[in-house]
């Protein structure tokens, strides 16, 4: 009875196994029918708008890249709390699944803009450089739905290129003006935005827990109007030492005021970065690799 | 970890009100949504609505304004719902939770009874 | 509204079977939630994002579905499966649920 009862444990134990390969097979199969479709609706290098019909709809790059689409571009994601499905591009290099939420590349697009602008998103959704902000009411939608990791990647006109890294990156909603929340920072370009660099200077440079500003809604520390002086949009204190958002220079500039894309603990704040792309990705994110 | 604490069980008279409360420990508080939910006596659940601590933005089912007030107390990481004009049909356990895409933390429910 | 219709309402089953539980949208949804829930407890998560197992849930536990069909498959019952099953969408405000499928185990 005893040699029965250990053959229907071994049995058992097979069928989980068969069970768990089936499933491993029936994901591979998936995967590789999936970028078989993908690699018809790929348009090349240039415009890569990724249109996955009405299957199904994901909550962020992370539901998409699991789900079997490994090749990079824009996709239409809807997140939990939204009213509806927007375009983001999606990062499927660098370990795959990031939503990216702002990038700047050539200076072609204004970031000069209102609160509105900077609520609803604008930009450039279509080219794979192209630069845009994906929205605050995007942000909050997505960040409040799981807890993220923000990845900022850095390059600046000598090629260099580095990275910060903050987790449980959340924004707020409207009512507390998209307020800005980082958790733990790690990565090789210095943490300019909770401003821990030094801390005398963290009461007035830090942008944990800032509201977000433009030229027409004033929500910083500052007598003045930072977005209005540094003509951005961001999540100013008094008022930075980090503004992604920032003109575009090529590299050193000189102006009124720091208004340039800065990074102030790697670059300082007279020098404008050639490069940025804004990424967030679940902290637990774990990626269905076969 | 991450804990919703409700208070307890409640007896009360119809045309009555009652406040139930839902403390949150093991995260920050105004980071994320919470929710209300319902579950009469042997039944299913329904959704009352959220609010987001970190402006008290709510959100409601149109079925459950005017009976239900959700607040917070941000200070003691706290989300409250007022439940008016009870009658017997309002008898349920209450539950909140708060929801993310891969997982979701529940209160333990609190169990409202409208009795004469 | 959306409205979620569950089939069966009560379902039985001996250890060991394959058994599937449906669920109906009245119109499109985006992805469907399944919670666990035993008397006495609150409902637990069991799938999310109509395919994804939550944390703990059991191997032997499948989500499927797309539009207005989805389902939950257990491939070989056990008794702790014992339970309901409730399916939820979050497509649309306001968030409804189904009504629940009670897993009886023979």
């Known amino acids: 009875l005893e040699d029965c009862a250990q053959e229907q444990m071994r049995l058992r134990a097979q069928v989980r196994l068969l069970e768990t390969r089936v499933k491993q097979q029936q994901v591979k199969i998936k995967q590789l029918l999936q970028e078989n479709e993908v690699q018809f609706l790929d348009k090349g290098d240039e415009n890569t708008v990724i249109d996955l019909g009405s299957k199904r709809q994901y909550a962020d790059c992370s539901e998409i890249f699991n789900d079997g689409y490994k090749l990079s571009g824009f996709y239409k994601i809807k997140p939990l709390q939204s009213p509806a499905e927007f375009s983001v591009y999606c990062d499927m290099s660098d370990g795959g699944g990031w939503t990216v939420i702002q990038r700047r590349s050539d200076g072609s697009e204004n970031f000069n803009r209102g609160w509105k602008d900077y609520e609803n998103g604008f930009g450039n959704f279509v080219q794979k450089h192209g630069e845009y902000w994906l929205g605050n009411k995007n942000l909050h939608f997505l960040t409040t739905q799981e807890d993220y990791t923000l990845k900022i990647d850095l390059a600046d006109f000598e090629k260099n290129s580095r990275y910060a890294q903050y987790k449980n990156f959340k924004v707020g909603d409207e009512k507390n003006f998209y307020e800005l929340n980082i958790g733990e920072y790690s990565g090789t370009a210095g943490d300019s935005l909770a401003g821990n660099f030094h801390p005398e200077v963290q009461w007035w440079a830090s942008h944990q827990r800032m509201k977000f500003s433009t030229w027409d809604r004033d929500h910083d520390n500052y007598e003045g109007n930072c977005a209005e002086e540094d003509q951005s949009g961001w999540w100013f204190n008094r008022c930075h030492s980090a503004n992604l958002n920032g003109v575009y220079y090529s590299g050193p500039y000189t102006a009124k005021t720091d208004n340039g894309i800065v990074w102030y603990t790697w670059h300082g704040w007279w020098y404008s970065l050639k490069s940025v792309v804004m990424k967030i990705r679940p902290n637990d994110f774990i990626p269905n690799v076969i | 970890q991450v804990q919703l604490q409700q208070s307890g069980p409640e007896l009360v008279k119809p045309g009555a009100s009652v406040k139930i409360s839902c403390k949150a420990s093991?995260?920050?508080?105004?980071?994320?949504?919470i929710n209300w939910l319902r579950q009469k006596p042997g039944q299913g659940l329904e959704w009352i609505g959220w609010i987001y601590p970190g402006s008290a933005n709510t959100n409601y089912n149109e079925k459950f304004k005017g009976k239900a007030i959700l607040t917070v107390d941000t200070s003691s990481s706290t989300a409250y719902m007022q439940l008016s004009s009870l009658t017997s049909e309002d008898t349920a356990v209450y539950f909140c939770a708060r929801w993310l895409l891969r997982s979701a933390y529940w209160g333990q429910g609190t169990l409202v009874t409208v009795s004469a | 509204d959306i409205v979620l219709s569950q089939s069966p309402a009560i379902l039985s089953a001996s250890p060991g079977e394959k058994v599937t539980m449906t669920c109906r949208a009245s119109s499109s949804v985006s992805y469907m939630y399944w919670y666990q829930q035993k008397p006495g407890s609150s409902p637990k998560p069991w799938i999310y994002?109509?395919?994804n197992l939550a944390s703990g849930v059991p191997a032997r536990f499948s989500g499927s579905g797309s539009g207005t069909s989805y389902s939950l498959t257990i491939s070989r019952v056990e008794a702790e499966d014992a339970a309901t099953y409730y399916c939820?969408?979050?497509?649309?405000?306001?968030?409804?649920f189904g009504g629940g499928t009670k897993l009886e185990i023979k």
């Open positions: 093991g995260y920050t508080f105004t980071d994320y949504y």
């Open positions: 939820q969408q979050w497509s649309s405000n306001p968030y409804t």
């Open positions: 994002a109509t395919s």
